[in-house]
Amino acid sequence: GITQSPKYLFRKEGQNVTLSCEQNLNHDAMYWYRQDPGQGLRLIYYSQIVNDFQKGDIAEGYSVSREKKESFPLTVTSAQKNPTAFYLCASSI
């Protein structure tokens, strides 16, 4: 399956925080979305192969890495002034 952690996270002002996303489905593609209250999902970043990733629609204030196929961590940087949201990770073949 696919595992995202933590379930809840509090960020101190000026801090970077990292959300973990791990999958054991042998999927090449992985995605990070953000959902704000009353809104649809918006794509932050996506990765289609190891060590490559592209910006989605709202990449400002976020960073990612894809060091291995199974993992696609998202860092919410201190530059992201409005980080409060629901974050969703997904993967596909």
Epitope: N51, D52, S65, E67, K68
Partner: antibody
Amino acid sequence: QVQLQESGPGLVKPSETLSLTCTVSGYSITSGYFWNWIRQFPGKGLEWMGYISYDGSNNYNPSLKSRITISRDTSKNQFSLKLSSVTAADTAVYYCASPSPGTGYAVDYWGQGTTVTVSS
Amino acid sequence: DIQMTQSPSSLSASVGDRVTITCRSSQSLVHSTGNTYLHWYQQKPGKAPKLLIYKVSNRFSGVPSRFSGSGSGTDFTLTISSLQPEDFATYYCSQSTHVPFTFGQGTKLEIK
């Protein structure tokens, strides 16, 4: 910052096996990425030889497939090249290398290179 | 294997000149993901190659803005807008779309 350093004999006899080791510092080779061997012939041409992945899987240049083995020693954070049945045509500068984060497979971490001469 | 053909093989130019090096691949370098894994390296004597441009047009960290890359499919160019003394070196294109990864034969840029 990832740093790579090749080591091994500079002279190998024809028909013998060339063995080189790359020691990686600043990053664990099991944490991610692909750990490559690339050689440069005296005429300056570059050839990708193959890699070992973070999970231990290999991908080799088919032109070398019957002669090449890339392995690793995770306890020492090293990966190694063995090339069997060498000839004078295998004389080259051998580099270990790994990709820079987020660039696809574009390599930007290189060892200093080690010159291997095949001669009796 | 994908053949990478660079032209010219050597080039003489002066400081301040605009220089273009071309690279042609024997097959399309568009990956199944839609990305194109064509890269440019600079090499100086006795040193390992250094990454300049990755994925056709992305300048690597610390690379001056006078270096730019363009192209698509099978035809690619590296342009140096205004040559500086430290730019005299050998330049290689490389593809990592298809295994085995391959390099061009190099373009040696010399001082006129």
